[in-house]
């Protein structure tokens, strides 16, 4: 058993039929010695008396809020949560496996630049009685500070018969050095509590591996005289690291017809303009990627050819 926060404790249980469970001793936080009784949750049934209460925790019915009283007055509370271990593996019931980039991916993280700010998100089908706490650091043995905010419900989607909820959190490395070579990964730890169930999830990454630039901005077309060609121009996204001479992007320019089956023309360039042929009813899209490190491409920025 360990303390998650003040008066909230996690009991770690091997979860199998007829498991013996864990013996837990609760102590009433009071100078009083006599006339103390214990109850669980909203029940008025007295579980025991005395300054300490010994219980055998085997299942969720044994978890909950234990309260010690004296003469009708509440003295203190202790909330017991359960963390299940089945076949040697901690349960992952609360979050959904996103299966990308690989199985057992519960947390996904992205950064728009090298500033040390990143966003992580996760999915669940649970709508209520759910809370999260997020901690992060660079490295684990001698951790350097990363500040994370509160988890926020960022999207709700309908997936077939189920509703899916996306939570996200923003974090900022306290003393980030954008130009430095990373040697220690960022560690992200999410504590999840649903009703009386506790779970934790972790992710480890280098900022360089989770970079995904915003799409190029100010995408414009300039027709070239007496030609079907157009000059496409764009700018670096505002959120990208500066100076651009050091933090450089490469771009992919795509001409796509109305039909998905039509051939796509693609041009790759390090410049912020390109000359392409504009077909009728086609659209021109541009996306960006770090020029020197193959992390994710940005989403497309698009304009119609007309």
């Amino acid at each position: 058993i360990w303390e998650l926060k003040k008066d909230v404790y996690v009991v770690e249980l091997d979860w199998y039929p007829d498991a013996p469970g864990e013996m837990v001793v609760l102590t009433c936080d009071t100078p009083e010695e006599d006339g103390i009784t214990w109850t669980l949750d909203q029940s008025s049934e007295v579980l025991g008396s005395g300054k300490t209460l010994t219980i055998q925790v085997k299942e969720f019915g044994d978890a909950g809020q234990y309260t010690c009283h004296k003469g009708g007055e509440v003295l203190s509370h202790s909330l017991l949560l359960l963390h299940k271990k089945e076949d040697g593996i901690w349960s992952t019931d609360i979050l959904k496996d996103q299966k990308e980039p690989k199985n057992k991916t519960f947390l996904r993280c992205e950064a728009k630049n090298y500033s040390g700010r990143f966003t992580c998100w996760w999915l669940t089908t649970i709508s209520t009685d759910l809370t999260f706490s997020v901690k992060s650091s660079r490295g684990s043995s001698d951790p350097q500070g990363v500040t994370c905010g509160a988890a926020t419900l960022s999207a709700e989607r309908v997936r077939g018969d189920n509703k899916e909820y996306e939570y996200s959190v923003e974090c900022q490395e306290d003393s980030a050095c954008p130009a430095a070579e990373e040697s220690l990964p960022i560690e992200v730890m999410v504590d999840a509590v649903h009703k009386l169930k506790y779970e934790n999830y972790t992710s480890s990454f280098f900022i360089r591996d989770i970079i995904k630039p915003d799409p190029p901005k100010n995408l414009q077309l300039k027709p070239l005289k007496n030609s079907r060609q157009v000059e496409v121009s764009w700018e670096y996204p505002d959120t990208w690291s500066t100076p651009h001479s050091y933090f450089s992007l490469t771009f992919c320019v795509q001409v796509q017809g109305k039909s998905k089956r039509e051939k796509k023309d693609r041009v790759f360039t390090d410049k912020t303009s390109a000359t392409v042929i504009c077909r009728k009813n086609a659209s021109i899209s541009v996306r960006a990627q770090d020029r020197y490190y193959s992390s994710s491409w940005s989403e497309w920025a698009s304009v119609p050819c007309s």
Epitope: V8, L79, D129, L130, T131, A151, L153, S154, Y167, D191
Partner: nanobody
């Protein structure tokens, strides 16, 4: 407990700008929505702007003039108020709705800041 602390109110001339901030603090809490409400003397409290599930919404009277935004790493929500009018004079309250873990279990919360006065007058 989740605490909300507002700042940024004050006296401004018509056409001027102000930026309100609201910082949420606490432990083990998840935010479902954050927003700004206002209450003018003798009137009902009304929603000015809110962010929920990643979507922003605004009262018709402030659309195009006010912008709500969040800094998630700092648990802070902002209200940038431009082109202020005398009818924007009110006490502005920050609101946060979500769930938190207490020793009673996971419970919903609906917290309000103490309010910050915005006066638009020449």
């Amino acid at each position: 407990e989740v605490q909300l602390v507002e700042s940024g109110g004050g006296l401004v001339q018509p056409g001027g700008s102000l930026r309100l901030s609201c910082a949420a603090s606490g432990s083990f809490f998840s935010i479902k929505s954050m927003g700004w409400y206002r209450q003018a003397p003798g009137k009902q409290r009304e929603l000015v702007a809110g962010i929920a599930s990643g979507v922003t919404n605004y009262a018709d009277s402030v659309k195009g003039r006010f912008t709500i935004s969040r800094d998630g790493a700092k648990n802070t929500v902002y209200l940038q108020m431009n082109s202020l009018k005398p009818e924007d004079t009110a006490v502005y309250y920050c609101n946060a709705v979500g769930e938190r873990l207490a020793n009673t279990g996971v419970t919903e919360y609906d917290y309000w800041g103490q309010g910050t006065l915005v006066t638009v007058s020449s």
